[in-house]
Interface confidence: low
């Protein structure tokens, strides 16, 4: 028998520094977790103690904090090289700055293979990107070899900016021939490493013949055997065992997100490469694990540029950006309109001639808007200003919801109107009329939404049985502010870009902004 230790991360999303327990900015160092300096300490400890160790990343290192905004992926290559990752799969967010934003800072700088079997380049890009990412890589580990085959969500064109010269194929269809190729090369221990979410991970384990282990990402899935050590509730045991169509027991793992945990899986293979046993658990990277001093010093050096960036002008406003709770928790506010417009703008993807865009709607809890921005400071808007407006370090995500769920959400928005509560919704691509004289649960008297399957966008009544795409804060997607119906009834959820980054990019693009209150949210009394 031969034993392999797989250490794995996924969806780190730019959390190079330690974070608080909820993966937002570290406030009390004694309680902070994760970060590459702490990760390195634990990885080195395991490398010293165990003979056959692989350190893998399942994608979405890009996007999530000011680190990515400023360094644009150079930080990912630098610190992943420093930690000596053995391989990485491409995630959807690796394409956020286009293909060039992937090639230059990461693909050309990484000292480890970057993988995806189901992304095929065409046209002029094919020769430019050739060899910079691979469908698979055979890695020597001790006296043996292990094949790593990569995959990426085929929804990436809807979630990021891969351009028109990359084709995202079905994962299972693309993986099978690559695994077969590895078998012909006498590689009998094969790990599928990828970024398509837990459901697809399980399907790959079930359907792709020859895959021994699946290491996934994208869905931020937390698996754990026994009593979990922090706030995350396990979606199942670690590893999650799938019985493949050919009768093998295939371990599937994922390690939540944000570098909070290091996945730790021990696999025992027989001499023919069959998995005999698998066990482990994610390791919580809490403050009991010291930060490595050399990596920490490097982080501090790279940090200097961030502090400088946060005070630089992104653009100007010529109007007061009303982000006060007195406005945004009671009525349409122009800060809410600005943020929603930025959220839609960030999701412009012309992937189908029938649609002007794949999504037109935005909702945003008024309680998530934490500060106004005064235009009388020469109109200047900085990252620091935006951090006061959006301090939670959340993301703006894409969900699919039925019209009936949206209607419930808007009823919830005003079910206890007048108490300055955070659930009052700001909107984009939506016209809503409330009648507060009616009883809670029956106050939405008009709800019109902007069409997507149209050449000239216009507002049509919401259809209860239709499925709509909506951009919203991850806080709402997870049922925050009492929006349990969104969490319970959403049909699909893909995590998006860092909230501040979305707004800052929009302001930089527009240069001068002047959002208005324009009748997106109205109040009426009596009949309609």
């Amino acid at each position: 028998a031969w034993e392999l230790t797989i250490l794995h991360t996924n969806d780190v999303h730019s959390r190079l520094e330690q974070t608080s327990e909820d993966s937002s900015k570290c406030v009390n160092a004694s309680r902070c977790m994760g970060g590459v300096a702490r990760l390195f300490t634990k990885v080195q400890q395991i490398r010293r103690a165990e003979p056959n160790v692989l350190l893998l990343d399942a994608g979405d290192q890009y996007q999530g904090t000011i680190w990515f905004t400023v360094y644009k992926g150079a930080e990912v290559a630098h610190f992943m090289n420093a930690l000596r990752y053995d391989a990485m799969a491409l995630g959807n967010h690796e394409f956020d700055n286009g293909v060039e934003g992937l090639i230059e800072p990461l693909l050309k700088e990484a000292k480890f293979p970057i993988l995806s079997a189901n992304i095929k380049a065409k046209g002029p890009l094919a020769s430019q990107i050739s060899g910079l990412y691979l469908p698979y890589k055979v890695l020597p580990v001790g006296d043996e070899v292990v094949g790593i085959v990569g995959y990426t969500s085929k929804e990436t064109p809807f979630l990021s900016n891969p351009g028109t010269n990359l084709v995202f194929e079905d994962e299972i269809t693309a993986l099978q021939p690559e695994v077969d190729k590895l078998k012909t090369l006498n590689v009998n221990k094969i790990i599928a490493l990828g970024h398509s979410g837990f459901e697809m991970d399980k399907l790959i384990a079930q359907k792709v013949r020859g895959v021994d282990v699946v290491v996934g990402g994208h869905s931020n899935t937390f698996l754990y055997t026994g009593n979990p050590p922090s706030k995350e509730v396990p979606a199942g045991k670690y590893p999650f065992i799938v019985t493949s169509d050919d009768g093998r027991k295939v371990p599937v793992v994922q390690a939540y997100a944000f570098g909070k945990y290091l996945g730790y899986l021990k696999i025992e293979f027989d001499e023919r490469g069959n998995v005999i046993s698998s066990h482990g658990n994610p390791i919580l990277l809490n403050s009991s694990i010291p930060e490595d001093p050399s990596i920490k010093a490097d982080i501090n050096k790279w940090r200097i540029k961030l502090d400088n960036y946060s005070t630089q002008e992104l653009g100007k406003t010529i109007v007061y950006l009303d982000g006060s709770s007195q406005s945004c928790r009671f009525r349409e506010c122009n800060m809410g309109n600005l943020i929603c417009d930025a959220m839609i703008n960030n999701n412009l993807r012309h992937t189908d001639e029938m649609f002007w865009n794949h999504v037109s709607m935005c909702i945003l809890n008024g309680g998530g808007i934490r500060s106004p921005i005064d235009e009388r400071n020469n109109g200047t808007i900085t990252w620091e200003n935006l951090a006061a407006v959006l301090p939670f370090g959340g993301t703006f995500d894409l969900v699919q919801l039925k019209g009936s769920t949206l209607k419930k959400a808007f009823e919830h928005s005003v079910h206890r109107y007048g108490q300055s509560t955070g659930e009052f919704l700001q909107v984009g691509g939506i016209h809503v009329v409330y009648d507060l004289s009616r009883k809670p649960g029956d106050r939405v008297v008009k709800l019109d939404v902007l069409c997507t399957k149209c050449r000239v966008p216009s507002y049509d009544p919401l259809k209860m049985d239709e499925v709509y795409k909506v951009i919203l804060p991850n806080f709402l997607a997870n049922g925050g502010d009492g929006f349990q119906m969104i969490k319970d009834e959403l049909l699909r959820h893909d995590s998006g870009d860092q909230d501040i980054n979305v707004v800052s990019t929009y302001i930089s693009k527009m240069k001068v902004i002047y959002p208005a209150v324009e009748g997106r949210i109205k109040f009426s009394t009596g009949s309609h």
Partner: antibody, heavy 120, light 111 residues
Framework: QVQLVQSGAEVEKPGASVKVSCKAS????????ITWVRQAPGQGLEWMGD????????NYNEKFKTRVTITADKSTSTAYMELSSLRSEDTAVYYC???????????????WGQGTLVTV | EIVLTQSPATLSLSPGERATLSCRAS??????????MHWYQQKPGQAPRLLIY???NLESGIPPRFSGSGYGTDFTLTINNIESEDAAYYFC?????????FGQGTKVEIK
């Protein structure tokens, strides 16, 4: 609804130890920090320390570090605060409180126990 | 540790008046756009009750006549249209770093 119910009043001799319990209900006990705060007669509030029941992580005020032990029993959703080497100035009402922080790590104390009077 | 100084020690007001309570921190308690300062009300024989968290956010169920403001080191709790039931001690508390500390309190009396 969220409730924190503390054990009853205690009278202890100087040098002895006291263990106060705090039973939580109405929320996920393992997901929120429990803090202990004390208030001497006619005085202000003093933060003693806290525990994250999910992992057992604790933080203590340096002033009490050598004398206080905070623990939690996940099976009964109960937190405990034990103070040893009691002296007369430890006479106070001892409160447990739940820290909030759903949308951010704000650590404000959103629910409190009724308090336990410890007389030394 | 961060020292919180509250003023005045006692405030005596008539119903309907506005109360302004101050809390000054010896060190900046703000980071990341937030001020980690909270306000509590305590009536005799009762446990404290959270009024305001993160300097300006009204806790659920607290009447809107209570409001908080400030950033960094200087914070204010305001009670508009004060009522007799508002007679109590008011404490500020920070959670910026360990140990978390409380102010010494302001006593609000209603004439």
């Amino acid at each position: 609804q969220v409730q924190l119910v503390q054990s009853g009043a205690e009278v202890e001799k100087p040098g002895a130890s006291v263990k106060v319990s705090c039973k939580a209900s109405g929320y996920t006990f393992t997901s929120y920090w429990i803090t202990w705060v004390r208030q001497a007669p006619g005085q202000g509030l003093e933060w003693m320390g806290d525990i994250y029941p999910g992992s057992g992580n604790t933080n203590y005020n340096e002033k009490f570090k050598t004398r206080v032990t905070i623990t939690a029993d996940k099976s009964t959703s109960t937190a405990y605060m034990e103070l040893s080497s009691l002296r007369s100035e430890d006479t106070a009402v001892y409160y447990c409180a739940k820290e909030g922080g759903l949308t951010t790590e704000d650590y404000a104390l959103d629910y409190w126990g009724q308090g336990t009077l410890v007389t030394v | 540790e961060i020292v919180l100084t509250q003023s005045p020690a006692t405030l005596s007001l008539s119903p309907g008046e506005r109360a302004t309570l101050s809390c000054r921190a010896s060190k900046n308690v703000a980071t990341s756009g937030y001020s980690y300062m909270h306000w509590y009300q305590q009536k005799p024989g009762q446990a404290p009750r959270l009024l305001i968290y993160l300097a300006s956010n009204l806790e659920s169920g607290i009447p809107p006549r209570f409001s908080g403001s400030g950033y960094g080191t200087d914070f204010t709790l305001t009670i508009n249209n004060i009522e007799s039931e508002d007679a109590a001690y008011y404490f500020c508390q920070h959670s910026r770093e360990l140990p978390f500390t409380f102010g010494q309190g302001t006593k609000v009396e209603i004439k």
